[in-house]
């Protein structure tokens, strides 16, 4: 085991080993955001699919209420892209007056909240000025890093404005996490 | 084994551990495209480098025809990056007699090919306007996510503009995959 | 193991099987950059923080001098995000007398020191024209892919203008590996 | 195999115009840049521009900004060049080119001749 | 707009002969050069993409290098039938534009 020849000679505790088939693992999709109240001050969560089409929870991973639920310790690689769409900012009426205008914005973030703690946690944020010459424009956002986490943490994803995420694809907007 | 005491004195079954070497796994990298015949109604795929540089297909991930084959079911991360780059779109030509041009685009979809369905699969799409002002511009598309795949899936990378796809270095445009 | 049944009477040497707890990883995240002597033709390296809030090194994963050693041979996923930010590049004076400016641009580049070979090589790049409108612009560029590293090799993450990283946030701007 | 074929030579009158035609054939036309570029008599090449067969948008150098228009047919896989006020320093060979990708030029049509004389 | 300037206009060599061919961008151009043969009476034919990759079906004696603004065509063993004129030729930015060509001739 790791790596040695199996001695019965001397009885040993090895580190936890374990089949990788049997680790928490979601994958989340998107689906059409209904109007709902959000937190003052902070970003809206979207809500997700968790079992239709592409998308999945496995392994104790849980998805409830715009939350993915962490069944374990340990470092999982989280992951979120959300593709955004809209009309021309405002930003390109060309330098009105010769004064530029503040450029509009897209973020998203990926939050942690441990509820033994009293603030989210931001893990990552994806922040881009929108500032196109277009009639309408779209591009997505990609985030992906990881983190060690704590059984009973829970993962959302905040966009800066739920009005403008794309929908339609399930291959477009999505989020997913794995313990490694 | 999965982090109990050895004990001979009782038999079990545990689920199947592998060693993380054994894993198929592949980075490919971009080559120039030559003009050739696509599918009609479907972005065209990109073949890739699989041997030469940062490239490998390891443990029976192997790449055949701008496929990469899936040698065994499981969960598996998937990603790829291309670098566009093109001249000033029509995009840019300002509101030409106060009517906003459709803005011209560039996307990323990696898609599955399962025989035994009629139909491929777009797992991940990247898609952006592109309504750029200065006279060349270039930027990329990054995609990652985690999928249930099957022994004989096949996966591809197809994009909207093939001749607009960054060929000239290896760290620009490529594409892998990991069982987990 | 690997999915046998338990079988004394006949030994056995197993692929290395290890606990995943035990393998080398990091998750680095932005600090202010201060003015340092950079190699010349080569874009400016980041340094990172490597134990505080998000940040950490594990499993003899070390980080020092700008570089994250490479502890084992294996297999790895490499990532990072840099979130830049500037004023408006001078291509957005929409094209003067006619003649399109060339874009600015921003380039992040993740690349392998291998004490043995003279050249660095680039493992990732990420780069994308810059050519806004609006009077202030941010945008970040993410990356990540798998890689066969060796023992002692050494990663960095190399920008090609450290005033424009945006290091006010630790989810913006960071930099990970870890085995797979 | 990839094939680019060019209507026939023409002799044309300064101040004509003149319409060259591209077949393509052995790949899919929409999905990459057409290109033209000509050569006078003992001299180097010139880029005079491309199409996106695609979504018809064109690029043409400066120099024939106003005097040239690229189209293309995609239901026939047929570009066209149609270059007008003629002048006597447009004889030239005319060639059509794809390119794998839009900066390059892997397959050349066979040349048209264009003279222009009075 | 970029201009390419070549070196030597002409030259003269014989079967087995190292030929080597400079090509010099006016300003950077990365890495998009690409080089081309061409003959009397012919269409020109593309050997080498991105400075240094060899076209599929080009022989491999037949090799660039260079970056920036400073490219190399070296054809390492001249054979009969590479007598011809080359031209370099930049795909950073519109208006692609073309060395003057160098003719390679038989001494």
């Known amino acids: 085991l790791k790596g040695q020849e199996f001695a019965p000679s001397h009885q040993q505790v090895y580190a936890p080993l374990r089949a990788d088939g049997d680790k928490p693992r979601a994958h989340l999709t998107v689906v059409r955001q209904t109007p709902t109240q959000h937190f003052k001050n902070q970003f809206p969560a979207l809500h997700w699919e968790h079992e239709l089409g592409l998308a999945f929870t496995k392994n104790r991973m849980n998805y409830t209420n715009k939350f993915l639920l962490i069944p374990e310790s340990g470092d999982y690689f989280i992951y979120s892209q959300v593709t955004f769409r809209g009309m021309t900012s405002e930003c390109s009426e060309i330098r009105q007056a010769g004064r530029p205008n503040k450029p509009d914005s897209i973020t998203v973030v990926i939050t942690k909240v441990t509820d033994s703690y009293p603030e989210p946690t931001q893990l990552l944020m994806g922040t881009k000025s929108v500032c196109e010459v277009g009639s309408n424009w779209f591009q997505p956002i990609y985030l992906g890093a990881m983190f060690s986490l704590q059984e009973g943490d829970k993962l959302m994803v905040n966009v800066s404005d739920i009005s403008l995420v794309d929908y339609t694809k399930e291959d477009k907007t999505f989020f997913g996490a794995f313990l490694l | 084994l999965k982090g109990q005491e050895f004990a001979p004195s009782h038999q079990q079954v545990y689920a199947p551990l592998r060693a993380d070497g054994d894993k198929p796994r592949a980075h490919l990298t971009v080559v120039r495209q030559t003009p050739t015949q696509h599918f009609k109604n479907q972005f065209p795929a990109l073949h890739w480098e699989h041997e030469l540089g940062l490239a490998f297909t390891k443990n029976r991930m192997n790449y055949t025809n701008k496929f990469l084959l899936i040698p065994e079911s499981g969960d598996y991360f998937i990603y790829s990056q291309v670098t566009f780059r093109g001249m000033t779109s029509e995009c840019s030509e300002i509101r030409q007699a106060g009517r906003p041009n459709k803005p011209d685009s560039i996307t990323v979809v990696i898609t599955k090919v399962t025989d035994s369905y009629p139909e491929p699969t777009q797992l991940l799409m990247g898609t952006k306007s592109v309504c750029e002002v200065g006279s060349n511009w270039f930027q990329p598309i990054y995609l990652g996510a985690m999928f249930s795949l099957q022994e004989g899936d096949k996966l591809m990378v197809n994009v909207s503009d093939i001749s607009l796809v960054d060929y000239t270095k290896e760290d620009k445009t490529f594409f892998g995959a990991f069982l987990l | 193991l690997k999915g046998q049944e338990f079988a004394p009477s006949h030994q056995q040497v197993y692929a290395p099987l290890r606990a995943d707890g035990d393998k080398p990883r990091a998750h680095l995240t932005v600090v202010r950059q201060t003015p340092t002597q950079h190699f010349k033709n080569q874009f400016p390296a980041l340094h990172w923080e490597h134990e505080l809030g998000l940040a950490f090194t594990k499993n003899r994963m070390n980080y020092t001098n700008k570089f994250l050693l490479i502890p084992e041979s294996g297999d790895y996923f490499i990532y990072s995000q840099v979130t830049f930010r500037g004023m408006t590049s001078e291509c957005s004076e929409i094209r003067q007398a006619g003649r399109p400016n060339k874009p600015d641009s921003i380039t992040v580049v993740i690349t392998k020191v291998t004490d043995s070979y003279p050249e660095p090589t680039q493992l990732l790049m990420g780069t994308k024209s810059v050519c806004e409108v609006g009077s202030n612009w941010f945008q970040p560029i993410y990356l990540g892919a798998m890689f066969s590293l060796q023992e002692g090799d050494k990663l960095m993450v190399n920008v090609s203008d450290i005033s424009l990283v945006d290091y006010t946030k630790e989810d913006k701007t960071f930099f990970g590996a870890f085995l797979l | 195999q990839v094939q680019l074929v060019q209507s026939g030579a023409e002799v044309k009158r300064p101040g004509a115009s003149v319409k060259v035609s591209c077949k393509a054939s052995?790949?899919?036309?929409?999905?990459?840049?057409l290109h033209w570029v000509r050569q006078a008599p003992g001299q180097g090449l010139e880029w005079m521009g491309w199409?996106?067969?695609?979504?018809?948008?064109?690029n043409y150098a400066q120099k024939f900004q106003d005097r040239v228009t690229m189209t293309g047919d995609t239901s026939i896989s047929t570009a066209y060049m149609e270059l007008s006020r003629l002048r006597s320093d447009d004889t030239a060979v005319y060639y059509c080119?794809?390119?794998?990708?839009?900066?390059?030029?892997?397959?050349w049509g066979q040349g048209t001749m264009v003279t222009v004389s009075s | 707009d970029i201009q390419m300037t070549q070196s030597p206009s002409s030259l003269s060599a014989s079967v087995g002969d190292r030929v080597t061919i400079t090509c010099r961008a006016s300003?950077?151009?990365?890495?998009?050069l690409n080089w081309y043969q061409q003959k009397p009476g012919k269409a020109p034919k593309f050997l080498i993409y991105?400075?240094?990759s060899l076209q599929s079906g080009v022989p491999s004696r037949f090799s660039g290098s260079g970056s920036g603004t400073d490219f190399t065509l070296t054809i390492s063993s001249l054979q009969p039938e590479d007598f011809a004129t080359y031209y370099c030729?930049?795909?950073?930015?519109?208006?692609?534009?073309f060395g003057p060509g160098t003719k390679v001739e038989i001494k």
């Open positions: 080119a794809v390119g794998g990708s839009y900066d390059a030029f892997d397959i």
């Open positions: 052995g790949y899919t036309f929409t999905a990459y840049y």
């Open positions: 199409i996106n067969p695609k979504s018809g948008g064109t």
């Open positions: 300003q950077s151009i990365q890495s998009y």
């Open positions: 991105g400075a240094s």
């Open positions: 030729q930049q795909g950073y930015s519109t208006p692609f534009t």
